[in-house]
């Protein structure tokens, strides 16, 4: 296993609809044709997998149908979107990139993006 640099933004604020997007960029050390991207969430010393996708270079990034993540890839840059976030989902979201094929295998883990989620205030009842 060889190390690889990964960069991602330090902080992102989710939209009022609970959607957060960020870029994950990696320093590819060679001609990888198969890449796996995983988003991990770290909160209270617990690390859980949020979503993962494997893609072939030049093809779309495909997450499972029931995933809360969507994304697109362009070169060594992945644009990730996480949906359905609530205030309780606030935490550090870490981008993990693996170059699966051809060998050698490379692994890169970003420093994480702190995603802040604020639940919208319910609208007051109107008299109209």
């Amino acid at each position: 296993c060889k190390a690889m640099h990964v960069a991602q933004p330090a902080v992102v604020l989710a939209s009022s609809r609970g959607i957060a997007s960020f870029v994950c960029e990696y320093a590819s050390p060679g001609k990888a044709t198969e890449v796996r991207v995983t988003v991990l969430r770290q909160a209270d010393s617990q690390v859980t997998e949020v979503c993962a996708a494997t893609y072939m270079m030049g093809n779309e990034l495909t997450f499972l149908d029931d995933s809360i993540c969507t994304g697109t890839s362009s070169g060594n840059q992945v644009n990730l979107t996480i949906q359905g976030l609530r205030a309780m989902d606030t935490g550090l979201y870490i981008c993990k990139v693996e170059l699966m094929y051809p060998p050698p295998y490379y692994l890169g883990i970003g420093n994480g993006t702190q995603i802040y989620v604020i639940d919208p205030e319910p609208c007051p009842d109107s008299d109209f």
């Epitope: 870029v23 960029e25 990696y26 590819s28 060679g30 001609k31 270079m57 070169g75 060594n76």
Partner: nanobody
Framework: EVQLVESGGGLVQPGGSLRLSCAAS????????VGWFRQAPGKEREEVAC????????DYPGSVKGRFTISRDNSKNTVYLQMNSLRAEDTAVYYC???????????????????WGQGTQVTVSS
């Protein structure tokens, strides 16, 4: 859209040095990571070096590490490749390529670059 033009190639003796330039026009180069690649006759294109947008991140394959140095001058919209201790096996057409990125990293994979120059010939021979 950015366009790239390489220059500085030529004939040099083994052990000699050359400095290649990759000049950009049509867009500011500071938005792009830049890579140098080379292709010898009958061989696949091979990675040589890359540099991130700010210049703080560079990467090289083992074949040129310690001999080649990549640098950039964003005020001149140019990236340079300083090649020292040249060997016969360094003979090739050298291409620069650009990729628009958000952060400071760069890639040594030709698959990641979408804009390419026309190349400049480097011949190392006595």
């Amino acid at each position: 859209e950015v366009q790239l033009v390489e220059s500085g190639g030529g004939l040099v003796q083994p052990g000699g040095s050359l400095r290649l330039s990759c000049a950009a026009s049509g867009d500011t180069l500071e938005s792009f990571a830049v890579g140098w690649f080379r292709q010898a006759p009958g061989k696949e294109r091979e990675e040589v070096a890359c540099i991130g947008r700010t210049g703080e991140f560079t990467d090289y394959p083992g074949s040129v590490k310690g001999r080649f140095t990549i640098s950039r001058d964003n005020s001149k919209n140019t990236v340079y490749l300083q090649m020292n201790s040249l060997r016969a096996e360094d003979t090739a057409v050298y291409y620069c390529a650009a990729e628009r990125l958000v952060f400071h990293l760069c890639s040594l994979s030709e698959y990641d670059y979408d804009t390419w120059g026309q190349g400049t010939q480097v011949t190392v021979s006595s």
